[in-house]
Interface confidence: low
């Protein structure tokens, strides 16, 4: 049940987002979320997760990359990238001369 809060051991994570109350937080796991909204540069948020574990299994897209880990400050130095979008001229196996 993904909407139940985790009751497992807590881990300390780096917290860098508008919702942070301090430099670290405690949760069931650590998160790094890279989001690109329409017409804006991608923004990376670091924090703690307690709900919706299923998000951790999502594959990166051109709009979001959701990373999870479960050890002390494991999200501190993680850098994410978004799935690159290919224009027809950039597709594999094509020559653009």
């Amino acid at each position: 049940d993904p909407v139940k809060p985790s009751r497992g051991p807590l881990v300390t994570c780096t917290c860098e987002s508008p919702h942070c109350r301090g430099p670290t937080c405690q949760g069931a796991w650590c998160t790094v979320v890279l989001v690109r909204e329409e017409g804006r540069h991608p923004q990376e948020h670091r924090g703690c997760g307690n709900l919706h574990r299923e998000l951790c299994r999502g594959r990166p897209t051109e709009f979001v990359n959701h990373y999870c880990c479960d050890s002390h400050l494991c999200n501190r130095n993680v850098s994410l990238v978004l799935e690159a979008t290919q224009t027809p001229s950039e597709q594999p196996g094509t020559d653009s001369q």
Epitope: K4, P9, R53, C56, R57, C69, D70, S71, C74
Partner: antibody
């Protein structure tokens, strides 16, 4: 390469307390969770519980009232105590590591101890 | 609590493909891990996170997970693959580990 080496008493009487210890070689305590799993003779695997680097624990509800898992970071060891044992607790007991990193959320056991057969008999 | 169901036994001839199933209610979104256990030995992780292999595990071992069934596939089965196989998940509703009952793979 992580190695787990475990030891403890192999023969107990009913109502006694099972006590096992697992030493960790070549691995960092802080990046993993440390687990105990048991296997009764001829049967399947049963997870007992886990402890993390800070000493926080998480136990199988069916055993929770009798189980204590603790760790000694100075010795890179963690221990299992199971109180009030009965014949139903006769099993091979394994210690195991759960790395909890990357995209794996929750436990997966990548390194195991050699196993200790614990027999409970009067 | 969450339950994983495995067939007690699977038999296959050498060189053929063995498929061992692990059933669970809506198991698809969960990460499924598989272990091989030979008599008198500790289990060995052979597939994790549905389909990834730890280093040292042959490519003959693969996994898939969808709907209500996860499957461990062993291609070109060898006599040395004869063992018990267990599936395992993390039950995120209560943060506990769940194992399947195990499947004995017999190589004919």
């Amino acid at each position: 390469q992580v190695q787990l080496q475990q030891w403890g008493a192999g023969l107990l009487k009913p109502s006694e307390t099972l006590s096992l210890t697992c030493a960790v070689y070549g691995g960092s305590f802080s990046s993993s969770y440390w687990n105990w799993i048991r296997q009764p003779p001829g049967k399947g695997l049963e997870w007992i519980g886990e402890v993390n680097h800070s000493g926080s624990t998480n136990y199988n509800p069916s055993l929770k009232s009798r189980v204590t898992i603790s760790l000694d970071t100075s010795k890179n060891q963690f221990s299992l105590k199971l109180s009030s044992v009965t014949a139903a607790d006769t099993a091979v007991y394994y210690c195991a590591r759960s790395p909890r990193s990357g995209r794996i959320v929750g436990a997966v056991f990548d390194y195991w101890g050699q196993g200790t057969l614990v027999t409970v008999s009067s | 609590s969450y339950v994983l169901t495995q067939p007690p036994s699977v038999s296959v001839a050498p060189g053929q493909t063995a498929r061992i199933t692990c059933g669970g209610n809506n198991i698809g979104p969960k990460s499924v891990h598989w272990y091989q256990q030979k008599p008198g030995q500790a289990p060995v992780l052979v597939v994790y996170d549905d389909s990834d292999r730890p280093s040292g595990i042959p490519e003959r071992f693969s996994g898939s997970n969808s709907g209500n069934t996860a499957t461990l596939t062993i291609s070109r089965v060898e006599a040395g693959d004869e063992a018990d196989y267990y599936c395992q998940v993390w039950d995120s509703s209560n943060d506990h580990v769940v194992f399947g009952g195990g499947t004995k793979l017999t190589v004919l």
